[in-house]
Structure formats: structure tokens, C-alpha cells
């Protein structure tokens, strides 16, 4: 937001000759310089094996500010979260590169059914204090059935959100042991206030 | 910006009903048009083979003006690279579709190790002056292993960057000749100031 | 839009310790409040087999305000179109979850040809009325060759492109029975006004 | 199980501070929101706020901005509440829940009593 | 702050009987959450989201509504039902709850 001692103030006119209007008649509209919203882009880390729940996707922890890294303008990150500081619609993105190794999906199929193939899936997730539960924002979600090789591939998703003050932003993965944690610019995560 | 012989000039108030502050107190917001931006969307035309050094990805080059291609706002594109005329935080995104024919790599296993199968990787770079090596912003990458058939897929990458006047972008892939570059719908590249 | 009974009246002057330029001096500069512009995100609902025309993909209906979907800022949404109220340059989204089962592209190729691979495709597409074809924007084309399996993959777009107040956007689908309509968060649309 | 474990019974004098505590086990805290509500004897369900563990981010219901204050440790999963200046008219049971994340567990509950 | 009035204050009932009780909200709220209270517990989440079944809740238990009114329904009163309800809204800050509804043994 625009901080001084007190507010931008925007004068309207009905008429583009006229001379400015009385100072009662000003609209304080809400404008804001665009350097000053809530912005974060973080890359990929190493992951620690953490403790996550049954029927939980674990969650990715980032890099807030080494290399390309970085949050802006009261966007915080910590502890896996994203922190919304301020109501507005956001544009919410993320990239995992995943690498692995199948060998055993191409297999003859037993009794005529086809194998339920290996996946990979990933989920932007919000939690919010205003609902009793995590709201899943964007998923991507794909069948892995490679032949006889080490395999990688990224998921890109990204979406815009009406997000409130308090929200927390998370990156949720199938299987966090698949995910390449190697560069930068394989694997992130950022949200930007529009 | 707003551009005009000086600069937008937004006054603030500390009290929303007195009249305009004396204008030693203006503040100078750095608020601007929209429009104003600079912005640019490129599209994919046929790639003439070119050198390109061992151990580096050639660069696409782009249609800047036909279709719907366009720059504006000071982006400029000239010789494989937008060009960023202003610092700030920008968006930047690609797709490059990818088509080709495999037909080895779900063959036995030689000596109990998989191949090391085919891939496809996109690459969004920054050169910056001041620095002199160029980074890699984004990477798209997939290992490509059909069962022995004409293949075809696109690698999507869009990101936030902070960059600086001056910088440039340019878009590099693992393989040119394996770029489709029949439709300005299925590859491109863009970038906008937000 | 600032909208009041004229216009956002911002003053330009050539030495920051000026007076206030006269009012005939006065640029009106196209400034308006973020919050104000023209969004959507729509979501995925179950699709009614419609009968579309041969050689033209069909096109995909969306759920505009349960869940995570949201219109705002006159951007409407009516009978498959996501209608555009203001002229600009708009960042336009979507991705698309197919899910199917293929068995028979790894068969034997005959006559030394490769089989020609099932595929799945989504275009974001711009109706105009002053132009009598459409315009495709986006295209995601992907070939489909998995061995003997339950598959599924996301298709993901985005970009930004100029357009005019009237315009209309919508998405295609090679196969409307191949997407996946369960959640809300895989199968997706958007767009909005920067 | 999921679970939250509150501290027990306390008895204060007006004037007298009182922190209570709520363990979590079987989900991360960081992960969810933790709120406090207060239910006077024979009265209903009144929200006091709710602190965010993963920032320490808090939100008061204002007619309890003053003498209340949410803290947590995540290390030991634990929310606390504490109240200042106590009056006889914060006799009560002050439960802690969740959300964010289901199944909503609500703690046991611990009765507070100010009396001279 | 949002005022949520419930009604009726006190709901005699029979087990087997259809009963539905009322929240009203003093301005317009996204969702409502509605709570059961057994003396001496801690309240337990019935209903989410204005109509979503919390975990474990049984499916006679239903809510509606949108706006300012809601309601929620017990199709067939059990006798384990014989509790306080109680509404809250989580759109404003701060969180309200409505003042209860006791549902007793007729």
C-alpha cells in the first residue's frame, strides 16, 4: 500500500478542464504502487525426511532467499508455509521435477486387467483458519510407466486464488523421495498479489 | 512509468477532510498505468541451423510483431533475446513443444543396467552484463522413451524474476531439430513486467 | 476502474518543488485500482455430451462460482465462454487432466511404419466477432503411447495475449470423454486482465 | 491418535496472571490453526483468537485483546494462553481446538477459577 | 462483529422425531459450522462448510442455508442426541457462535 502519514489521494473530475474540484469532493481510491505487493519465488532444497501422517502427502520446505530466491513485501516463508499477509487474489505457481526408476509396469497383465501404473502427484495446498480443513488448490497428477529406465519429468502448475489475510500456502508431493532437489530452476514455488 | 515532462505527483493527507497539503509535502509514488508496461509474447517460426558452443543449448529464435506476436512498452527483441528495459519483477513463461521418433529405448537391458533414455529439456536463460556467467532461470527436462512411434510433447515453464534494466532472455532447448515450429500456438515465449 | 463522475486525475510537473501546474496541464493517466480488474477462475464440472461439428474439437463447460471458481469485475462466463468486458492484454490459463487406458501402440509396427500414437490436445480458443475464424491462442498436444495401462496426465497453458472488449474465450478437447471432471483443482480456466 | 492435551484445574487470585497449556500429538501443528474459546459457567461458547504456529501470527477477538495472549512452541507442540489482571468474571473453562485440518479435535478443557 | 441469533432457545423433542433448529446472522456470511455439547465435554464438529458431514457425525444430521439463514436437521432424533447445538460463523473476524439451542427430552 501507499504509506505516508495518511492516504493516496486521488481527485476526480467531471469535466478534464475544470478546475480541481473541492477538497471535499476527493475519492481516496485504493492504488498502489505494484513494487509494493506481496511477491515470493523459492527453490528447491534438499529434503529432510520428516514425520508425515497417514493419508497426508508430505510437504516441500524451500529456499527463501539464496540465488533466485526470494519474498517480498511482507510475504514470509516459513516452515514449509507461505504466508498470505494481505487479502487479494494471487497468482499461485509451482514446478517439481521428479526423477526415478520403473522397470516392472510393462509387465504381461495378470488375469486381463491392466497394472495400476506408478504416479507421481503434485498439490498446491492452502490452509486457511476460516475452514476446518486444508483446501486442495491445484493438483497434478500423472501415470508413471516407463520401460526399463531411469525416468524424470517435471508437473507445472499454476493458477490465480482469492487468498485472505492468514492463509498458508503449501506444496504437497506424492513421494518426496522422487523429487530432483539438484538445480534451482527444476524445482519452485512462488505466488505473486495481482 | 507514467511518462510526462516530470512525474506522477499523488499527494497524501493526514486527515482525509483538510485541504491539499503544501506540495513540499507531496509524495512521489512510484504508482503507473497498467498498460504501460513492458510486455512481449513470441512465437516459434522455423529454426535455421546455427553454431552453438559444445556444452550449451542453442537458443530458439522468435516472431516478435506477426500473428500474435507482439512487444511493447520498451521490450524489445532483437537475436534470440527480449530484451528488459526496465528493473523490476517480471513474469516469464515458455512453452516449447517437442516431436520425434524413438524406438530403442525399451529394448533389454544391457548388462542388468536401464539406457540411459532420450530427453528433451527447455531452458530459460538470463545474460546479464554484470555477470559472467549466464543463469538458468528455468528447466523444463524429460526423459522421452516411446514404445516405437512418432512422439510429440510440450515442456511448459512460467516463473517470477526479479531482473534489471538491461538484462536478457533468451530460450534454450536441448535439440533444435526436434522443436515443432508449425504453430505459433504450440511454442512461444513471453515475459511481462509486473 | 476508478470510477467516480470523471476521471483519476493525476498531475505531472517538470521540478518536483514546483507549484501545481496549471489544470490545463493535467494528464489523465489510465490508473485504476488492482481489485477492480476483470478475473475468473472456473473450475471443471461433469460435461454433457454435446454434438459439435466434425473436425472442430469440443469445447469444455465450467462450474463460475461453487468451490474455487470465481467471476469478478464484469469478466462473465456464459455457455461455454469466458466473455471479455475491458480491452487489454490478459494472462489466459488452463489445464486439462486426461485420464484412459491405451493397450495396443506397442504392438508390432507393420510395414516398418510406426503406428501413428493416440494423442490428447487442449486449445484455448478466441472467438472475435469482427474476424469470422477463430484464433487459437494456445495449443497442448501430447502423444499417448502407454503400454497396457490405466493412464493420467495433466496438460497445462498459459500466456498472455491482447484482447478487445467482446472478445470470448473457451477451451477445446481432442476428447471430452477422456477428461477428468472429479476435482476441481486437476481440470481448469482462467484469465485476467494485468 | 490426533489429539490436544490441555493442563489441569487452576485456582488464581483477582489480579493474578494464569498461562494454560495445550499438547498436540498426532499432527504437526505448524500445519493447522490453534483457537482458544471460553465458556463461562452456565453461559455459551464465546471465541477468544486464534494464533497461527507456523508464524506466530495471532487474531483477538478485541474483548479479549488486552489480557490475553496466544503463544506456541512448536518444538514441544504445545499452544499456551495466558491471561493477566484476572477477574471473577473469567471463571471458566477455556478449551483449545484446531483447524485447518480435520478430523476438528477440540482439547478436554481446562477450568480456570479467580476468586479472593 | 456478525450476531448470530439461534431459535428457538429451547427444542423439546421425542426420540424418532424430525427436528430442525435456526441460526440467523446479522450480515452475510460464507459458511456456518454447527456444534454439538454434552454437559461437562468439549464441543463436537457436526456440521462443516454449512452442509458437509464432520467425520463420524451420523447422517441424520444435516444443515442448509446460505446468506444469513441456516438450519440445521435431525431427521430422526436419537437419544444421544439430547445435547446443546450451537452455530459459528468463521467469515468475520471476530468468530462468533450463536447462543444455543438446547434440544431436550419431551
Known amino acids: 500500500q501507499l504509506r505516508a502519514q495518511g492516504e493516496a489521494c486521488v481527485q476526480f473530475q467531471a469535466l478534464k478542464g475544470q478546475e480541481f474540484a473541492p477538497s471535499h469532493q476527493q475519492v481516496y481510491a485504493p492504488l498502489r504502487a505494484d513494487g509494493d505487493k506481496p511477491r515470493a519465488h523459492l527453490t528447491v532444497v534438499r529434503q529432510t525426511p520428516t514425520q508425515h501422517f497417514k493419508n497426508q502427502f508430505p510437504a516441500l520446505h524451500w529456499e527463501h532467499e539464496l540465488g533466485l530466491a526470494f519474498t517480498k513485501n511482507r510475504m514470509n516463508y516459513t516452515n514449509k508455509f507461505l504466508l498470505i499477509p494481505e487479502s487479494g487474489d494471487y497468482f499461485i505457481y509451482s514446478q517439481v521435477t521428479f526423477r526415478g526408476m520403473t522397470s516392472e509396469c510393462s509387465e504381461i497383465r495378470q488375469a486381463g486387467r491392466p497394472n495400476k501404473p506408478d504416479s507421481i502427484t503434485v498439490v498446491i495446498t492452502k490452509v486457511t483458519d476460516s475452514y476446518p480443513e486444508p483446501t486442495q488448490l491445484l493438483m497434478g497428477t500423472k501415470s508413471v510407466c516407463e520401460v526399463g529406465s531411469n525416468w524424470f519429468q517435471p508437473i507445472y502448475l499454476g493458477a490465480m486464488f482469492s487468498l485472505q489475510e492468514g492463509d498458508k500456502l503449501m506444496v504437497n508431493v506424492s513421494d518426496i523421495s522422487l523429487v530432483d532437489y539438484t538445480k534451482e530452476d527444476k524445482t519452485f514455488f512462488g505466488a505473486f498479489l495481482l | 512509468q507514467l511518462r510526462a515532462q516530470g512525474e506522477a505527483c499523488v499527494q497524501f493527507q493526514a486527515l482525509k477532510g483538510q485541504e491539499f497539503a503544501p506540495s513540499h509535502q507531496q509524495v512521489y509514488a512510484p504508482l503507473r498505468a497498467d498498460g504501460d508496461k513492458p510486455r512481449a509474447h513470441l512465437t516459434v517460426v522455423r529454426q535455421t541451423p546455427t553454431q552453438h558452443f559444445k556444452n550449451q543449448f542453442p537458443a530458439l529464435h522468435w516472431e516478435h510483431e506477426l500473428g500474435l506476436a507482439f512487444t511493447k512498452n520498451r521490450m524489445n527483441y532483437t537475436n534470440k533475446f527480449l530484451l528488459i528495459p526496465e528493473s523490476g519483477d517480471y513474469f516469464i513463461y515458455s512453452q516449447v513443444t517437442f516431436r520425434g521418433m524413438t524406438s530403442e529405448c525399451s529394448e533389454i537391458r544391457q548388462a542388468g543396467r536401464p539406457n540411459k533414455p532420450d530427453s528433451i529439456t527447455v531452458v530459460i536463460t538470463k545474460v546479464t552484463d554484470s555477470y559472467p556467467e549466464p543463469t538458468q532461470l528455468l528447466m523444463g527436462t524429460k526423459s522421452v522413451c516411446e514404445v516405437g512411434s512418432n512422439w510429440f510433447q510440450p515442456i511448459y515453464l512460467g516463473a517470477m524474476f526479479s531482473l534489471q534494466e538491461g538484462d536478457k532472455l533468451m530460450v534454450n532447448v536441448s535439440d533444435i531439430s526436434l522443436v515443432d515450429y508449425t504453430k505459433e500456438d504450440k511454442t512461444f515465449f513471453g515475459a511481462f513486467l509486473l | 476502474q476508478l470510477r467516480a463522475q470523471g476521471e483519476a486525475c493525476v498531475q505531472f510537473q517538470a521540478l518536483k518543488g514546483q507549484e501545481f501546474a496549471p489544470s490545463h496541464q493535467q494528464v489523465y493517466a489510465p490508473l485504476r485500482a488492482d481489485g477492480d480488474k476483470p478475473r475468473a477462475h472456473l473450475t471443471v464440472v461433469r460435461q454433457t455430451p454435446t454434438q459439435h461439428f466434425k473436425n472442430q474439437f469440443p469445447a469444455l463447460h465450467w462450474e463460475h462460482e461453487l468451490g474455487l471458481a470465481f467471476t469478478k469485475n464484469r469478466m462473465n462466463y456464459t455457455n461455454k465462454f469466458l466473455l471479455i468486458p475491458e480491452s487489454g492484454d490478459y494472462f489466459i490459463y488452463s489445464q486439462v487432466t486426461f485420464r484412459g487406458m491405451t493397450s495396443e501402440c506397442s504392438e508390432i509396427r507393420q510395414a516398418g511404419r510406426p503406428n501413428k500414437p493416440d494423442s490428447i490436445t487442449v486449445v484455448i480458443t478466441k472467438v472475435t466477432d469482427s474476424y469470422p475464424e477463430p484464433t487459437q491462442l494456445l495449443m497442448g498436444t501430447k502423444s499417448v503411447c502407454e503400454v497396457g495401462s490405466n493412464w493420467f496426465q495433466p496438460i497445462y497453458l498459459g500466456a498472455m495475449f491482447s484482447l478487445q472488449e467482446g472478445d470470448k474465450l473457451m477451451v477445446n478437447v481432442s476428447d471430452i470423454s477422456l477428461v477428468d471432471y472429479t476435482k476441481e483443482d486437476k481440470t481448469f480456466f482462467g484469465a485476467f486482465l494485468l | 491418535q490426533v489429539q490436544l492435551v490441555q493442563s489441569g484445574a487452576e485456582v488464581k487470585k483477582p489480579g493474578a496472571s494464569v498461562k494454560v497449556s495445550c499438547k498436540a500429538s498426532g499432527f504437526d501443528i505448524c500445519d493447522t490453526y490453534m483457537h482458544w474459546v471460553k465458556q463461562a459457567p452456565g453461559q455459551g461458547l464465546e471465541w477468544m483468537g486464534r494464533i497461527d504456529p507456523a508464524s506466530g501470527h495471532t487474531k483477538y477477538d478485541p474483548k479479549f485483546q488486552v489480557r490475553a495472549t496466544m503463544t506456541t512452541d512448536t518444538s514441544t507442540s504445545t499452544a499456551y494462553l495466558e491471561l493477566s489482571s484476572l477477574r471473577s468474571e473469567d471463571t471458566a473453562v477455556y478449551y483449545c481446538?484446531?483447524?485447518?485440518?480435520?478430523?476438528?479435535?477440540w482439547g478436554q478443557g481446562t477450568t480456570v477459577t479467580v476468586s479472593s | 462483529e456478525i450476531v448470530l441469533t439461534q431459535s428457538p432457545g429451547t427444542l423439546s423433542a421425542s426420540p424418532g422425531e424430525r427436528v430442525t433448529m435456526s441460526c440467523r446472522a446479522s450480515s452475510s456470511v460464507s459458511y456456518m459450522y454447527w456444534y454439538q455439547q454434552k454437559p461437562g465435554q468439549a464441543p463436537r464438529l457436526l456440521i462443516y462448510?454449512?452442509?458437509n458431514l464432520a467425520s463420524g457425525v451420523p447422517d441424520r444430521f444435516s444443515g442448509s442455508g446460505s446468506g444469513t439463514d441456516f438450519t440445521l436437521t435431525i431427521s430422526r432424533v436419537e437419544p444421544e442426541d439430547f445435547a446443546v447445538y450451537y452455530c459459528?460463523?468463521?467469515?468475520?473476524?471476530?468468530?462468533?457462535f450463536g447462543g444455543g439451542t438446547k434440544l431436550e427430552i419431551k
Open positions: 462448510a454449512t452442509s
Open positions: 481446538s484446531r483447524s485447518g485440518g480435520l478430523p476438528d479435535v
Open positions: 459459528q460463523q468463521w467469515s468475520g473476524n471476530p468468530r462468533t
